[in-house]
């Protein structure tokens, strides 16, 4: 039967991708959608993309926000189109803040599949911070 | 009903390189990922590449990866793997394969030697 | 890497009598979202791979009940009830839980006596 679709691997969706490590894609497959915000030297810097492995996203999706950083994971095609992760409010705004869209997005390749992925890890959604 | 056409295998010297192609028909061909899966002689399957379904995802196994490039035409139905650097390990049947691995093409066999 | 094994390598039935195959692997194939990506796959001599069963006992549609599926985690097993002439040929294990990189066993070569 052609509609018959057996599961023989993970689902997987359709995701927007915002940022550098996109390339000319605006959008990129995986088994999780993410839409995250962290702050860089000042700057609000914002990513969306995919978690091409469950696994890769599991930890990083679990992770509540922080003053720094939030990530908000998602299930289904296109679903992290109009999510905008949030940072925790404190009762004022963080000083000297600006909205800069897209900015200081690295390329996170999963090297042991090979994959030619707009993937990013847990490490580099926590890599603006920590410096 | 669902057709996979491979082209392009022959015989090359190591070193060398190959391009085959996999026509599909009988189904929306931008609505499946598809994957290249080969077959060394009187030998086991092995996983090759995958690419998703806008041609956005490649991924590799690590014993191609470097060296084999899939790409996808969706306008033209078409599925491709250029091979460079080819070695004699490299030897098999090629079959392109679509989600979820219920259709196969009968395969292109490549052989590698001098 | 999840590495699979298949036993037997080879497996002489006779017509009419069950045929059983394992495969085992190096790691649970149980993905964080609650399902087991093991198929069984059939090749016929000079023909491509088929796909018979998928998340460990579901047959895909046209394939006859003498074949079932079971097991869990790192265990699994397919069966023949009654080996038909159409049988014969080699029958694979994959793995889809560590998605893209899927891995198949070795194989088993269903013969008749």
């Known amino acids: 039967m052609e509609d018959e679709k057996p599961k023989v691997n993970p689902k997987l969706y359709m995701c927007v991708c915002e940022g550098l490590s996109c390339g000319n894609e605006d959008h990129c497959e995986g088994q999780q959608c993410f839409s995250s915000l962290s702050i860089n030297d000042g700057f609000h810097v914002y990513q969306k993309g995919c978690f091409q492995v469950y696994e890769q996203g599991k930890m990083t999706c679990k992770t509540p926000p922080s003053p720094g950083q939030a990530v908000e994971c998602c299930q289904g095609d296109w679903c992290n189109r109009n999510i905008t992760a949030q940072l925790p409010t404190k009762g004022k705004s963080f000083p000297g803040t600006q909205n800069f869209h897209l900015e200081e997005q690295k390329l996170i390749s999963e090297e042991d599949l090979g994959g030619e992925q707009k993937l990013i890890s847990e490490e580099d959604l926590h890599h603006h911070h920590h410096h | 009903q669902v057709q996979l056409v491979e082209s392009g295998g022959g015989l090359v010297k190591p070193g060398g390189s190959l391009r085959l192609s996999c026509a599909a028909s009988?189904?929306?061909?931008?609505?499946?990922?598809m994957s290249w899966i080969r077959q060394a002689p009187g030998k086991g399957l092995e996983w090759v590449s995958y690419i998703s379904r806008t041609g956005s995802t490649k991924y590799y196994a690590d014993s191609v990866k470097g060296r084999f490039t899939i790409s996808r035409d969706n306008a033209k139905n078409s599925l491709n793997l250029q091979m460079s650097s080819l070695r004699a390990e490299d030897t098999a049947v090629y079959f392109c394969?679509?989600?979820?691995?219920?259709?196969w093409g009968q395969g292109t066999l490549v052989t590698v030697s001098s | 890497k999840i590495v699979l094994t298949q036993t037997p390598l080879s497996s002489p039935v006779t017509l009419g009598q069950p045929a059983s195959i394992s495969c085992r692997s190096s790691q649970s194939l149980v993905h964080s979202d609650g399902d087991t990506y093991l198929s069984w796959l059939h090749q016929r001599p000079g023909q491509p791979p088929r796909l018979l069963i998928y998340t460990i006992s579901n047959r895909l549609s046209g394939v006859p009940d003498r074949f079932s599926g079971s097991g869990a985690g790192t265990d699994f097993t397919l069966k023949i009830s009654r080996v038909e002439a159409e049988d014969v040929g080699v029958y694979y294990c994959?793995?889809?839980?560590?998605?893209?990189?899927?891995?198949f066993g070795g194989g088993t070569k269903v013969e008749i006596k």
């Open positions: 394969a679509r989600e979820p691995l219920q259709h």
């Open positions: 994959m793995q889809g839980t560590q998605f893209p990189a899927l891995t």
């Open positions: 009988g189904f929306t061909f931008s609505d499946y990922y």
